[in-house]
């Protein structure tokens, strides 16, 4: 119901498509939602290894 | 901390509807997915479906005809029903919830299901 | 459906030494530059816990002794070194394409 076809980009792709301000992607269902509605993943406690990089999760500039 | 709660019977016979509840404290089930998983004795685990945000549901299509995923945000909980079950249905069932990635990092304890004449 | 086909179902480990575990998925589970690939231990009596997502990501307060690599179809967790508490068994999940799949499981035991 949520994967139509679609490209299969790699690892260094582009973001998805941008979101207006104030909205995030929702990954699993492919679309701009309000950022409230989206929970990312627990902060790493400070000090931790391998930040997580930008992702299209994020609002856009 | 988001904190996951199982309940409903532990037996239930052949042909018979399950219906399991998740209750859910530490956020609002008017966010992010809420999903229901089994695990089959032997290890093997199937995710069953979800309902986000929004009230849309996603349901394999291994138990589409059979399957039902509902919630009261009133009550901050939301509910399995799984019809016409067989002895292939007898599981451990789980609430979990997802961040954005789908990676499940919170689940209930899990709810022991037995179905048997 | 994207089947994700574990390797070995089993492992014996000695204290101290390094487990690897392989995922290796039908199709790829990569999109818009993410690998859509988690993996979480299960012990007896209790629910699966996230260990990784995203293939590489440690969750949040777990030992850096895990680790996750791979893109596309093939996926590993390694845990160095091994320590008594981690006799488990270790699924790999997809989120890419429904229906979201998990791995059969890998059983990690002592030697």
């Known amino acids: 119901m949520r994967r139509g076809p679609r490209s299969l980009r790699g690892r260094d792709a582009p973001a998805p498509t941008p979101c207006v301000p104030a909205e995030c992607f929702d990954l699993l269902v492919r679309h701009c939602v309000a950022c409230g509605l989206l929970r990312a993943p627990r902060p790493k406690p400070a000090g931790a290894s391998s930040p997580a990089p930008r992702t299209a999760l994020q609002p856009q500039e | 901390e988001v904190q996951l709660q199982e309940s409903g019977p532990s037996l239930v016979k052949p042909s018979q509807t399950l219906s399991l509840t998740c209750s859910v404290t530490?956020?609002?089930?008017?966010?992010?997915?809420w999903n229901w998983i089994r695990k089959f004795p032997g290890n093997k685990l199937e995710f069953m479906g979800y309902i986000n945000y929004s009230g849309t549901t996603y349901y394999n299509p291994s138990l589409k005809s059979r399957i039902s995923i509902t919630r009261d945000t009133s009550k901050n909980q939301y509910y399995l029903q799984l019809n016409s079950v067989t002895t292939e249905d007898t599981a451990t069932y789980y609430c979990?919830?997802?961040?954005?990635?789908?990676?499940?990092?919170?689940w209930g304890q899990g709810t022991t299901l037995t179905v048997s004449a | 459906d994207i089947v994700l086909t574990q390797s070995p179902v089993s492992l014996a480990v000695s204290l101290g030494q390094r487990a690897t575990i392989s995922c290796r998925a039908s199709?790829?589970?990569?999109?818009?530059?993410?690998?859509?690939m988690h993996w979480y231990q299960q012990k007896p009596g209790q629910p699966p816990k996230l260990l990784i997502y995203?293939?590489?990501d440690l969750e949040s307060g777990i030992p850096a002794r895990f680790s996750g690599s791979g893109s596309g179809t093939d996926f590993t967790l390694t845990i160095n070194p091994v320590e008594t508490d981690d006799v488990a068994i270790y699924y790999c999940q997809q989120t890419s394409k429904d229906p979201w799949t998990f791995g059969g499981g890998t059983k990690l035991e002592i030697k």
């Open positions: 979990a919830t997802p961040h954005t990635y789908g990676a499940m990092d919170y």
């Open positions: 530490g956020d609002s089930i008017t966010r992010g997915y």
């Open positions: 995203r293939a590489s």
């Open positions: 199709e790829s589970v990569d999109d818009y530059g993410i690998s859509f």
